[in-house]
């Protein structure tokens, strides 16, 4: 098997399968490049965030160039050895979401609740519509909490 000079790096292996495996890879001359050998593909150095291998690495030791992910459609936010970028998240209107920060080559889309929608969990995959009050509002709907409504028959001072 191929060997290499010492490498010590925190990398993410998205390994052409789209799987994220964070690891510290340490290799020394005459040792196997543990973590760099995947499915018969052999990579010496990872691509930086925002890029991917132009093609899969091969056992013969030639090192494919890194090429950029498709801006606004794909990203990679960590160094990795994959020939694929991750696709950008779509902020799905049907789940009550809208774009807060657009996807870049190095960062996935950030979503937030649409106006008049809220989400009370820490990671929002779905936002619910704010309740419309029939008898008046105690507390307005926010991004993280639903409207609090007055009950029927309650009086305001």
């Amino acid at each position: 098997r191929l060997s290499s000079k010492s490498v010590n790096a925190q990398v993410t292996d998205i390994n052409s399968k789209g799987l994220e495996l964070r690891k510290t890879v340490t290799t020394v001359e005459t040792q196997n490049l543990e973590g760099l050998h995947h499915d018969g593909q052999f990579c010496h150095k990872p691509c930086p965030p925002g890029e991917r291998k132009a093609r899969d690495c091969t056992v013969n030791g030639d090192e494919p160039d890194c090429v950029p992910c498709q801006e606004g459609k794909e990203y990679t936010d960590k160094a990795h050895f994959s020939s694929k970028c991750r696709r950008c998240r779509l902020c799905d209107e049907g789940h009550g979401l809208e774009v807060e920060i657009n996807c870049t080559r190095t960062q996935n889309t950030k979503c937030r609740c649409k106006p008049n929608f809220f989400c009370n969990s820490t990671v929002c995959e779905h936002c619910d519509p704010c309740t419309k009050c029939e008898h008046g509002i105690i507390k307005e709907c926010t991004l993280t909490s639903n409207t609090k409504c007055k009950e029927e028959g309650s009086r305001s001072n």
């Epitope: 399968k17 799987l19 498709q70 459609k73 998240r89 799905d92 209107e93 049907g94 995959e125 779905h126």
Partner: antibody, heavy 121, light 111 residues
Framework: QVQLVQSGAEVKKPGASVKVSCKAS????????MQWVRQAPGQGLEWMGE????????NYNQKFKGKATLTVDTSTSTAYMELSSLRSEDTAVYYC??????????????WGQGTLVTVSS | DIVLTQSPSSLSASVGDRVTITCKAS??????????MNWYQQKPGKAPKLLIY???NLESGIPSRFSGSGSGTDFTLTISSLQPEDFATYYC?????????FGQGTKVEIK
């Protein structure tokens, strides 16, 4: 309600091309990617590719690159899939489906009724 | 490509039975803690219909007797009490990696 209505069945000769349409209604067409899936007679489902109607960006299954071409007409909320150089193996039902995203998991929530394309000499 | 293998390929069951269909992926379809697996139902001559997305989320309008579970490489679709309208073919589908792939299908027939 959300609906995808596809064009009718087609019979084509080998070597010909065919263009299948998929008209969307009941939602904002440019807000959701459109997916295309094929199903050969008696077989399972096979993903062909997708198109973002907001900018016509396409992403194909490598197997269908050069075989299928995806386009949209936003003025009529219609997606199209053209198949070229038809062979008997292309005989299948072709479906369009609306794409949804739940935390980066893409799935197909509404499907067209399917268009049968038969390739026969 | 990620290969999805469903089992069984077909099964015979009676109305009221609990039915379990499994889908095994050739490699993990999880990413950042999320499972990228969906389930569809298809009846003869009809388009597929979404049942479950992201492994365990029930699509709006689908009866609660359908449920999904699993992570990594092993996923399950369960019908808690089979109804006459549930006799159909069921497909799993992964969306973690392109090309997106489907299982070969599981046909649920009347015993």
């Amino acid at each position: 309600q959300v609906q995808l209505v596809q064009s009718g069945a087609e019979v084509k000769k080998p070597g010909a091309s065919v263009k299948v349409s998929c008209k969307a209604s009941g939602y904002t067409f440019t807000s959701y990617w459109m997916q295309w899936v094929r199903q050969a007679p008696g077989q399972g489902l096979e993903w062909m590719g997708e198109i973002d109607p907001s900018d016509s960006y396409t992403n194909y299954n490598q197997k269908f690159k050069g075989k299928a071409t995806l386009t949209v007409d936003t003025s009529t909320s219609t997606a199209y899939m053209e198949l070229s150089s038809l062979r008997s193996e292309d005989t299948a039902v072709y479906y369009c489906a609306r794409n949804r995203d739940y935390s980066n998991n893409w799935y197909f929530d509404v499907w067209g009724q399917g268009t049968l394309v038969t390739v026969s000499s | 490509d990620i290969v999805l293998t469903q089992s069984p390929s077909s099964l015979s069951a009676s109305v009221g039975d609990r039915v379990t269909i499994t889908c095994k992926a050739s490699q993990s379809v999880d990413y950042d803690g999320d499972s990228y697996m969906n389930w569809y139902q298809q009846k003869p001559g009809k388009a597929p219909k979404l049942l479950i997305y992201a492994a365990s989320n029930l699509e709006s309008g689908i009866p609660s007797r359908f449920s999904g579970s699993g992570s990594g490489t092993d996923f399950t679709l369960t019908i808690s009490s089979l109804q006459p309208e549930d006799f159909a073919t069921y497909y799993c589908q992964q969306s973690n990696e392109d090309p997106r792939t489907f299982g070969q299908g599981t046909k649920v027939e009347i015993k």
